[in-house]
Interface confidence: low
């Protein structure tokens, strides 16, 4: 029988025993920073090389007895989960272990830093294929540990870490809070967040995704053929490290940004019961459970996007929150959200040569979040077009006027404390769908991108009666790049993307005024890239999809009709 | 403890001459900051990671560490450089009294200092 966790990470329609090849992950080296390990365990012998690196604090307590099997317990189990012959995710991955945790499972930030430095030096001395570093540990928020992780990630290393077992916001812990690290929370066989005693898995915006982390069968250091069940976010992180090794083995050239986007894309969506999380964390916590991709061939033809939430701005009147994309990603849209509804919108602005998404709090507001939609769009050239407040009854509008640029997102920002409910017309002039429309007192920002084969369309879902949530989703084959609300009136709490769905939240219906005021429209911008699809087809030498272009052409929406008259 | 006392004697002798000509003022610009773990039981006072500015070379890191030892020795404090970082972050790990933090923050090239803290298997 296949352990539940290996079954769970196997894509639907596949059997885990057939799907997981014995050489999966063979081109990848996984570094494990943990306790000592029992390297001659049958699950991992010959697969794990114990380095001579050791940096651990003394064990606490005078009555502590160092027992080899206890000292090795945590690390041995995790090595087995990553690459074990029998119960491992990436059975072909080779591993290297560094001892940074003592026999009580305790280490130091400094010891971990020196371990990361050791890995970097090893990489420089003897460059190998893709590297994955598994950090199944957590401490309090550490600027220096996060900085070291950032540097290692920028050197091309994929870092995977445990979100932490404190039933708390993962952003309060390191390395879980490092944006460059892939942070993993734990779920159980019922896809519920894992409870560990009185605590449980961490959650929040610093978690990238969840993975199996309860009752995970793996190598036990009690004997060379023993198995044991362990639970925790370390086990969850080990699954993702294994999945990452499998993906990198299939596509060794994947960047960290591409790998993260794929992990998110292939995850099971919306299966976690969010009621387990504190109410204020539910919207911030990704509802994703990691899974292997359904094919070892790349998925390079897809336009991948993910949602990145900022930290909370705090309640001061002029407070702002900033959400950033990873260096290799494009910011295609920006939105904002406030639980109190008091906000002054959001704008895309340049910072250090890159676009960021900034949300603005309003007087009396409890604070805002900025929400960035971050996408992988090779050879993209994106810019922001801004229209100042129109001061006219028609409302403010802005479009992408450069030839070949398409609209990927709309943002609006206002200086007035309360926009009131003066509604601009929701309907756009026909033939000009590539425009952002907003309140007349707001400045409007259009994200306009040029990329080979990129095409986008606007989808709207309007509800005349007040409703707490309005959603609109992009159809199969299209990716949500932009999510905003029309109109930007005061009862709209904000808009954000959840996977391929644009969600617009409004104040509790009981607090809103008349039904006419309650009308809300969710506006999604859905894009796809013909260029990526064609490149992928050429790469796979496939002719079976020859009809794709005709379908694309038939469905294509031409944004620039008014330009064509001039040629 | 005996070893450390031995180190101390050695440091005072080896570094005092070097210390005299060194200015204590930091480079122009922002003042270095101090960080420590928000979770008190996880703090490890007495050991500090001194992080230097991004483009600092290894030789400068070593020189800054020696400077700290010399200045501390002059004030009668024992310090021990446990590790000099290079490859990921420039800086060094030092065992010293918290009394020396103010002095360490004023050293040239220092970006920030973080008190060491515990991490745990999850």
């Amino acid at each position: 029988s296949i352990p539940w966790n290996l079954e769970r990470i196997t894509p639907p329609r596949y059997r885990a025993d057939e799907y997981q090849p014995p050489d999966g992950g063979s081109l990848v080296e996984v570094y494990l920073l943990d306790t000592s390990i029992q390297s001659d365990h049958r699950e991992i012998e010959g697969r794990v090389m114990v380095t001579d690196f050791e940096n651990v604090p003394e064990e606490d307590g005078t009555r502590f007895h160092r027992q080899a099997s206890k000292c090795d317990s945590h690390g041995t189990h995790l090595a087995g989960v990553v690459s074990g012959r029998d119960a491992g995710v990436a059975k072909g991955a080779s591993m290297r272990s560094l001892r940074v945790l003592n026999c009580q499972g305790k280490g130091t930030v400094s010891g971990t830093l020196i371990g990361l430095e050791f890995i970097r030096k090893s990489q420089l001395v003897q460059p190998v294929g893709p590297l994955v570093v598994l950090l199944p540990l957590a401490g309090g928020y550490s600027r220096v540990l996060n900085a070291a992780c950032q540097r290692l990630a920028r050197a091309g290393v994929v870092l995977v870490t445990a979100a932490g077992n404190f039933r708390d916001d993962a952003c309060l812990y390191s390395p879980a809070s490092a944006p460059e690290v892939i942070t993993v929370g734990a779920t159980n066989a019922q896809d519920q967040p894992v409870t560990l005693g009185t605590l449980g898995t961490n959650f929040g915006r610093c978690v990238d995704l969840f993975a199996p982390g309860e009752d995970i069968i793996g190598a036990s250091s009690d004997c060379s053929t023993c198995f044991v069940s362990q639970s925790g976010t370390s086990q969850a992180a080990a699954h993702v490290a294994g999945i990452a090794a499998m993906m990198l083995s299939a596509e060794p050239e994947l960047t960290l940004a591409e790998l993260r986007q794929r992990l998110i894309h292939f995850s099971a969506k919306d299966v976690i019961n969010e009621a387990w999380f504190p109410e204020d964390q539910r919207v911030l916590t990704p509802n994703l459970v990691a899974a292997l991709p359904p094919s070892t061939h790349g998925a390079g033809w897809q336009l991948f996007c993910r949602t990145v939430w900022s930290a909370h701005s705090g309640p001061t009147r002029m407070a702002t929150a900033v959400a950033r994309c990873a260096p290799d990603e494009e910011l295609l849209s920006c939105s904002s959200f406030s639980r109190s509804g008091k906000r002054r919108g959001e704008r895309m602005e340049a910072q250090g040569g890159k676009l960021v998404c900034r949300a603005h709090n309003a007087f009396g507001g409890e604070g805002v979040y900025a929400i960035a939609r971050c996408c992988l769009l090779p050879q993209a050239n994106c810019s922001v077009h801004t229209a100042p407040p129109a001061e006219a009854s028609m409302g403010t509008r802005v479009h992408c006027h450069q030839q070949g640029h398409v609209l990927t997102g709309c943002s609006s920002h206002w200086e007035v404390e309360d926009l009131g409910t003066h509604k601009p017309p929701v309907l756009r002039p026909r033939g000009q769908p590539n425009q952002c429309v907003g309140h007349r007192e707001a400045s409007i920002h259009a994200s306009c991108c040029h990329a080979p084969g990129l095409e986008c369309k606007v989808k709207e879902h309007g509800i005349p009666a007040p409703q707490e949530q309005v959603t609109v989703a992009c159809e199969e084959g299209w990716t949500l790049t932009g999510c905003s609300a029309l109109p930007g009136t005061s009862h709209v709490l904000g808009a954000y993307a959840v996977d391929n769905t644009c969600v617009v939240r409004s104040r509790d219906v009981s607090t809103t005024g008349s039904t006419s005021e309650g009308a809300v429209t969710a506006v999604a911008i859905c894009c796809r890239s013909r260029h990526l699809a064609q490149a992928s087809q050429e790469l796979q030498g496939s002719t079976s999809g020859s009809g794709l272009n005709d379908i694309f052409e038939a469905q294509k929406i031409e944004w620039h009709e008014h330009h064509h008259h001039h040629h | 403890q005996e070893d450390e006392d031995g180190d101390y004697e050695e440091l005072v002798l080896a570094l005092r001459s070097e210390e005299d000509g060194l200015a204590e003022a930091p480079e122009h610009g922002t003042t270095a900051t101090f960080h420590r773990c928000a979770k008190d039981p996880w703090r490890l006072p007495g050991t500090y990671v001194v992080v230097l500015k991004e483009e600092t070379h290894l030789s400068q890191s070593e020189r800054t560490a020696r400077r700290l030892q010399a200045q501390a020795a002059r004030r009668g404090y024992l310090t021990k450089i446990l590790h000099v970082f290079h490859g990921l972050l420039p800086g060094f790990l030092v065992k010293m009294s918290g009394d020396l933090l103010e002095l360490a923050l004023k050293l040239p090239h220092v970006d920030y200092i973080e008190e060491d803290s515990s991490v745990f298997a999850q």
């Epitope: 049958r42 012998e45 023993c226 | -």
Partner: antibody, heavy 121, light 112 residues
Framework: QVQLVQSGAEVKKPGASVKVSCKAS????????MHWVRQAPGQGLEWMGY????????KYHQNFKDRVTMTRDTSISTAYMELSRLTSDDTAVYYC??????????????WGQGTTVTVSS | DIVMSQSPSSLSASVGDRVTITCKSS????????????LAWYQQKPGKSPKLLIY???TRESGVPDRFSGSGSGTDFTLTISSLQPEDFATYYC????????FGQGTKLEIK
């Protein structure tokens, strides 16, 4: 068919070393771990250790740890067991036996014919 | 180390007899994940190499006659020969592979 063919009998003096070979045929050498088991005259079977031919990883029984070396040459599908500092107690038949490298197949399904090593002054 | 104790150390029987050999281990050989007992039985004839009969305590190796059967779990195991044949007179060994490998001291089965 699957076969493990061992080298011929050896007579050694105390303090000397002996190296026994085991040539595999009829299967993929690196897919199976190679174990060594010995049997003193009129006695039972005693496990000495194993080598994983694919990785070269070895594991020795505590009793032999300091004296035994197991190696392999994958190019000729041969495993070797060398025992040093021989005493008369090492007089025995030495067997190689294969074990499939998978999940929980920890049994020896094919054995060599055995090599008699006699230690005598 | 796990200690394997076989009994009896020798026994005499006739062709057609039903014979039972027992093997006790000093600790459980049941693997919690696979629910398999890591115990095997081998037969050895004088001057010959051992031959695998039973693995996982009760699974017969291919080509082994069905008069040989294995049973037991945890620490107590049995090898049964339902109807002795002339070629079955040999020495039988149990072997644990739960933690490294240990053989029992052997049971010599002789013609009465």
């Amino acid at each position: 068919q699957v076969q493990l063919v061992q080298s011929g009998a050896e007579v050694k003096k105390p303090g000397a070393s002996v190296k026994v070979s085991c040539k595999a045929s009829g299967y993929t050498f690196t897919d199976y771990w190679m174990h060594w088991v010995r049997q003193a005259p009129g006695q039972g079977l005693e496990w000495m250790g194993y080598i994983n031919p694919s990785s070269g990883f070895t594991k020795y029984h505590q009793n032999f740890k300091d004296r035994v070396t197991m190696t392999r040459d994958t190019s000729i599908s041969t495993a070797y067991m060398e025992l040093s500092r021989l005493t008369s107690d090492d007089t025995a038949v030495y067997y190689c036996a294969r074990q499939y490298d998978y999940d929980e197949d920890w049994y020896f399904d094919v054995w060599g014919q055995g090599t008699t090593v006699t230690v005598s002054s | 180390d796990i200690v394997m104790s076989q009994s009896p150390s020798s026994l005499s029987a006739s062709v057609g007899d039903r014979v039972t050999i027992t093997c006790k281990s000093s600790q459980s050989l049941l693997n919690s994940r696979t629910r398999k007992n890591f115990l095997a039985w081998y037969q050895q004839k004088p001057g010959k190499s051992p031959k695998l009969l039973i693995y996982w305590a009760s699974t017969r190796e291919s080509g082994v006659p069905d008069r040989f059967s294995g049973s037991g779990s945890g620490t107590d195991f049995t090898l049964t020969i339902s109807s002795l044949q002339p070629e079955d007179f040999a020495t039988y060994y149990c072997k644990q592979s739960f933690n490294l490998f240990t053989f029992g001291q052997g049971t010599k089965l002789e013609i009465k």
